[in-house]
């Protein structure tokens, strides 16, 4: 370690000065002070590889990745990005440290990735790895739609303040529950901003643009439905509009609806009523309670009462900031190879979350289902029995939430072998992590039962490959062993697997797959 160079990796942020950005003069930008990137030797890497902390950059931002090297004598270097070599010109600072820089002007998606810097000095060669990613803040926005009452009309306007301008549609359904799924024949869509028919069972407004689709449901209490076991709860942020619809059907018009907040009647101008006769000549009444911009004191129990139905309530909670409530402790699971299993996260959130499940740096779509108790659940079953780390990530603009899961698949080892002129290596990824034995095959021991007690080096689970543990064992070869067959065996509680290796001079090594018990 004392012989290795002292490396410092820094990030320099530049405030773009558009008139000069992109010109080849040295740093046509105002620079912020350098930020340390914690360069350190990558564990268990072949050769001397330093790694810098992952860098996250905004689109169009300009940065410099810089390496300061404390090493005697001259250095030469080469940058490599996406298999292309880039020019590298080291210079020396006042402290006589070698300085190598990579300027990235106006960051784009194509400039994200791994930047490799190869440095050669008189004493040693080494590599420095920078991972640069784009921060996920887009210039485009898609905001959840909200409702407003149309001036002088009994109609609702749906508004979504989004860029680019979204297409707004009403999604209406007159059935209950599952039959109101998006693609159901019971669902009617109207691509317009104003809705006059406000008597439907389920009313949603959706806005969509390049970023996707966001929907808001009109919160409804139906006095003809059996109340939920848990009180329905509606969350809103300070300043957002509140809309609650109370709906009731009766055999004739001889009934009325009223709204109360904490046993006090709502003020005039905070509600409006509509009524109509249905096809079977029953009367439908709806009464809207609305507040154009809620404050903390709008929190409370909103109760809809009828002269002919039992009253029902909803709890409206006004929060300063959105939230995601869930337990973020990591969870470890151990399952059999063909066992059915799903990861599951139960959460309460407002506004509604966007979420992803990630495995092996690949994102999977995330579905969420609302439960009756005000919580939601997201399940992930598409793990295909691949062991490793699975990440559930949710965000809603105000809050972020990450939960880690580890999946271990119980299975017997599968051995992979490789050899060089000086050693033979075997590795296996079975679980539980296997132990190793090495046997020598000779005239005395044709069945390869003679133990090799020396020269074996085991590295249990030396590397995390997206959370998957790998165990390896290496046999250092002596001259006396050349030309012999040796056998490495990995075993755990589920079985044993072996590989036979012919130890000879460098060149192709024949491997004989042995019996697996």
């Amino acid at each position: 370690n004392q012989d290795l160079p002292v490396i410092k990796c820094v990030l320099i942020n530049h405030k773009n000065n558009d008139s000069s950005v992109g010109k080849s003069s040295s740093y046509p930008m105002v620079s912020e002070s350098p930020e340390d990137l914690g360069c350190a030797l990558r564990p268990q890497s072949a050769g001397t590889v330093y790694e810098a902390a992952t860098v996250e950059v905004d689109v169009s931002a300009s940065i410099t990745l810089q390496v300061l090297v404390d090493t005697p004598g001259n250095i030469s270097c080469l940058w490599v990005f996406k298999h292309s070599s880039l020019n590298c010109q080291p210079h020396f600072d006042v402290q006589n440290r070698g300085v190598v820089s990579m300027v990235i002007l106006k960051m784009t998606e194509t400039q994200a990735g791994e930047y490799l810097l190869f440095i050669q000095s008189e004493a040693t060669n080494y590599t420095i790895v920078f991972t640069v990613s784009i921060r996920n803040t887009l210039l485009f926005t898609l905001r959840r739609p909200y409702f407003r009452k149309m001036e002088n009309q009994d109609a609702l306007v749906c508004i979504s303040e989004s860029v680019p301008e979204p297409i707004v549609e009403w999604v209406l359904c007159d059935s209950q529950g599952e039959s109101c799924k998006e693609e159901s024949p019971a669902v009617v869509k109207k691509e317009e901003k104003v809705l006059h028919e406000l008597f439907g069972t389920d009313i949603r407004c959706c806005a969509r643009n390049e970023l996707g689709r966001e929907c808001t449901r009109l919160f409804t209490i139906d006095l003809n439905q059996t109340p939920q076991t848990t009180l329905p709860q509606l969350f809103l942020k300070v300043g957002e509009p509140l809309w609650i619809r109370c709906k009731a059907v009766h055999v004739n018009h001889g009934f009325g609806l009223t709204w109360e907040l904490e046993n006090k009647a709502l003020e005039e101008g905070s509600y409006f009523e509509m009524s109509t006769y249905s096809t079977n000549r029953t009367m439908i009444r709806i009464l809207f309670a609305f507040v154009s911009s809620v404050a903390r004191n709008d929190t409370g129990y909103y109760t809809c009462s009828s002269s002919k139905h039992p009253s029902q309530s909803a709890l409206v909670t006004i929060v300063e900031k959105g939230f995601i409530n869930a337990t973020n402790s990591s969870e470890d699971y151990e399952i059999d190879q063909y066992e059915e299993f799903c990861f599951s996260v139960r959460f309460k959130a407002y506004p509604q979350i966007r979420c992803t499940w990630t495995f092996s740096r690949k994102a999977f779509p995330c579905e969420q289902k609302a439960l009756d108790d005000g919580y939601s659940v997201s399940k992930f079953c598409n793990h295909k029995h691949q062991p490793g780390e699975y990440i559930f990530h949710a965000e809603n603009g105000d809050a972020q939430f990450t939960k880690m899961f580890t999946l271990n698949i119980r299975r017997k080892p599968q051995v992979l072998a490789e050899a060089s002129a000086s050693q033979a290596s075997c590795s296996s990824d079975g679980y539980p992590l296997p132990s190793w034995t090495w046997k020598k095959c000779s005239d005395k021991s044709p069945n390869c039962t003679e133990d090799i007690p020396e020269g074996v080096w085991n590295r249990k689970a030396n590397r995390k490959v997206f959370g998957q543990w790998v165990s390896s064992s290496t046999l250092n070869m002596s001259e006396a062993m050349k030309g012999f067959l040796v056998k490495c065996c990995a075993y755990n509680s589920l079985g044993t697997s072996c590989e036979t290796i012919l130890l000879n001079s460098p060149g192709p090594f024949p491997f004989i797959q042995d019996s697996i018990s």
Epitope: L11, N13, E35, D36, L37, G38, A40, R42, P43, Q44, E51, A52, A53, T54, V55, E56, V57, I63, E114, V129, T131, N328, S329, S330, D332, Q400, T402, M404, T406, L433, K460, A461, N462, R463, K464, F466, W469
Partner: antibody, heavy 124, light 107 residues
């Protein structure tokens, strides 16, 4: 130059809430996968890990203290704040913050830089 | 939570001695382990990360080994400035946990 500095009250009364601030310089949460750990050490005893927060707001807490701890960060001030409710004399300790670095290939470096620590005494 | 058991809890040694401290995890933690040195009244200092990687600026007489559940910190030739308390820390699984420490004293 990377530095971390803890600040907060020297003396806290039982049942009160402790608020500790770790002010960092020489690195930031804004542009790199960085995090901060809080660790404490009662006089003459071992180190105890309390909580951490990463640049992406990923957080984790000590199981035994989870209900009492909240960790947050203020990127603009380069600060990480730890609050601990319902303080008790057994919480008397030196509280340290230390840096965590996250790397693209999936490993972490814990505590390459530490603050000098701040001694908090809980007494009525 | 994963328990980290350090042994011995204290040891006496002379300058030039080879010193070995072990840390055992209650379950496999791969190589997600660091070793720290702490002197009285000072903050801990990182010596070894990822079980066996030497932190920049740390003398090469310090070395770490092991993976899975058993880990070792070795000081090949004890120097006067090495008398201190040493801790291991696992970051394999939350909550991260320290060993109870090993105090290295002058014989």
């Amino acid at each position: 130059q990377v530095t971390l500095k803890e600040s907060g009250p020297v003396l806290v009364k039982p049942t009160e809430t402790l608020t500790l601030t770790c002010t960092v310089s020489g690195f930031s949460f804004n542009n790199a996968r960085m995090g901060v750990n809080w660790i404490r050490q009662p006089p003459g005893k071992a180190l105890e890990w309390l909580a951490h927060i990463f640049s992406n707001d990923e957080k984790s807490y000590s199981t035994s203290l989870k209900s009492r701890l909240t960790i947050s960060k203020d990127i603009s001030k380069s600060q990480v704040v730890l609050t601990m409710t319902n303080m008790d004399p057994v919480d008397t300790a030196t509280y340290y913050c230390a840096r965590i670095v996250g790397y693209g290939s999936g490993w972490r470096l814990l505590g390459d830089y530490w603050g000098q620590g701040t001694l908090v005494t809980v007494s009525s | 939570a994963i328990q980290m058991t350090q042994s011995p809890s204290s040891l006496s040694a002379s300058v030039g001695d080879r010193v070995t401290i072990t840390c055992r995890a209650s379950q496999g933690i791969t190589n997600d382990l660091g070793w720290y040195q702490q002197k009285p009244g000072k903050a801990p200092k990182l010596l070894i990360y990822a079980a066996s990687s030497l932190q920049s600026g740390v003398p090469s007489r310090f070395s770490g080994s092991g993976s899975g559940t058993d880990f070792t910190l070795t000081i090949s030739s004890l120097q006067p400035e090495d008398f201190a308390t040493y801790y291991c820390l696992q970051d394999y699984n939350y909550p991260w946990t320290f060993g109870q420490g090993t105090k290295v004293e002058i014989k």
